[in-house]
């Protein structure tokens, strides 16, 4: 339905850095009109580090994640805080630097090979956004020699962009968040306007992928003030008309 | 192995409340979107609330106002608290969670909720 | 709300026989790139198991014999060779919209 597509707001308009979530992106949302009731958000606290505000971890860069600055503080202010390097203290995947994942609250190493049965209760502890992937686990024992690794495919709960296969980012999708595909050229995204709102967004869009950016569609048949859809376009710096 | 158990059902007046729990174990409960879903003697299934990960609730229109959810992380539990109830609540209530993918893929066994004077 | 129509309301059909199932939506579940339709399977006194995804990709531990297709407004679940377990009733679910909605289910019986 058309609502559904209007409502279905892109995460970033950036492709992410390699290997990660995106950095800090513009943002602006709006939530499904009518039907969800969400019920407030809640997060916990950790020690601050820089003031980019956010809302989820998705907002950060890779080597950050969202939560409140102080011990006890306003559950409605967030930023991005460093990521915890490994040894260091955590309560969630999200909170641990790249190559590492929280377990039994310390930040690991997941370099080496790590069977399900390591990680059977330290997949994710929630804070904030926080979904880890398990594509490729199954939750039958006879089936948990799968790698940690695995990327996930369409569908499958993610954490962050870099849990997902090639071709995919991680992006929410009504209340879990789930490897969606990377818009191609023509799809429609949304160009975010506003920072630090993303928790209101039940169902985000991935960014445009390479070479695309996320632009208004060139439409003459209306009128240039009339609201108009952004569509994901190969770069251009200007539009000359050039005459053959 | 991951486990769902929901408790808490019973006989209850119209009019009345009651309050539904769900035990989980086998995975790291606080991480992960978890929703209650009922089923009224032999009709289909229908989905009654949620709350995700990052503690945010959702409910359909009609419970939205009489129906509550909510978690305890703690604890590894799930609620229901169902005020108002109507005839029409009658059901199994289970609880049911999203792990690997979005669809509702591990479920409990499920309690009853009986609402009749 | 989306809704969603199974048919037959009731399948009867032999072991090894094939089961086709329909699930037509009254809009399409697609959306991001993925048909957001599930299929489940219940048995008497149980609860559902979740057999297909995203329409065509299965669930953790479910047989080779359980397939999904379709997309749009579309959607079949197709059991290749039906065991004795696996008369039950099926269910199809779509996750594109809020509130997410089942179909009213298709019941296999044995012949």
């Known amino acids: 339905t058309l609502n559904s597509v209007l409502n279905s707001n892109a995460i970033k308009n950036l492709p992410p850095p390699l290997g990660g979530a995106a950095g800090h992106p513009g943002s602006a949302v709006s939530a499904a009109p009518g039907i969800l009731y969400p019920g407030g958000n809640k997060y916990q606290t950790i020690d601050n580090y820089q003031p980019y505000p956010c809302a989820e971890d998705e907002e950060c860069g890779t080597d950050e994640y969202c939560a409140s600055p102080t011990r006890g503080g306003d559950a409605g202010v967030q930023i991005c805080l460093a990521c915890r390097k490994r040894r260091k203290r955590c309560m969630r995947h999200a909170m641990c630097c790249p190559g590492n994942y929280c377990k039994n609250g310390i930040c690991v190493s997941s370099d080496q090979n790590h069977f399900r049965g390591e990680i059977e209760e330290t997949i994710t502890e929630s804070f904030g956004n926080d979904h880890s992937t398990l594509d490729g686990y199954s939750r039958r024992t006879t089936l948990s020699s799968k790698m940690y690794h695995t990327k996930g495919q369409e569908g499958s709960v993610c954490l962050r962009s870099s849990d997902c296969a090639s071709g995919l980012c991680c992006a929410r999708h009504f209340w879990s968040k789930i490897c969606k595909p990377v818009l191609k050229e023509g799809q429609v995204c949304t160009k975010h306007r506003r920072k630090g709102s993303h928790g209101l967004e039940i169902f985000q869009r991935c960014y445009c992928g390479e070479g695309l950016s996320c632009r208004i569609q060139k439409d003459h048949h209306q009128a240039s003030n009339s609201s108009r859809l952004h569509t994901c376009q190969r770069h251009h710096h200007h539009h000359h008309h050039h005459h053959h | 192995e991951v486990q769902l158990v929901e408790s808490g059902g019973g006989l209850v007046q119209p009019g009345g409340s009651l309050r539904l729990s769900c035990a989980a174990s086998g995975f790291t409960f606080s991480s992960y979107a978890i929703s209650w879903v009922r089923q009224a003697p032999g009709k289909g299934l229908e989905w009654v609330a949620s709350v995700s990960g990052w503690m945010d609730t959702y409910y359909p229109d009609s419970v939205k106002g009489r129906f509550t959810i909510s978690r305890d992380n703690a604890k590894n539990s799930l609620y229901l608290q169902m005020n108002s109830l109507r005839a029409e609540d009658t059901a199994v209530y289970y609880c049911?969670?999203?792990?690997?993918?979005?669809?509702?893929?591990?479920w409990g066994q499920g309690t009853t909720v009986t609402v009749s004077s | 709300e989306i809704v969603l129509t199974q048919s037959p309301a009731t399948l009867s059909l032999s072991p090894g026989e094939r089961a086709t199932l329909s699930c037509r939506a009254s809009?399409?579940?697609?959306?991001?790139?993925?048909?957001?339709m599930n299929w489940y399977q219940q048995k008497p006194g149980q609860a559902p198991r979740l057999l297909i995804y995203a329409a065509s990709k299965q669930g953790s531990g479910i047989p080779a014999r359980f397939s999904g297709s379709g997309s749009g407004t579309d959607f079949t679940l197709t059991i290749s060779s039906l065991e004795p377990e696996d008369f039950a009733v099926y269910y199809c679910q779509q996750s594109k919209e809020v509130p997410p909605t089942f179909g009213g289910g298709t019941k296999v019986e044995i012949k």
């Open positions: 809009e399409s579940v697609d959306d991001f790139g993925i048909s957001f």
């Open positions: 049911a969670t999203s792990l690997e993918n979005y669809a509702f893929d591990y």
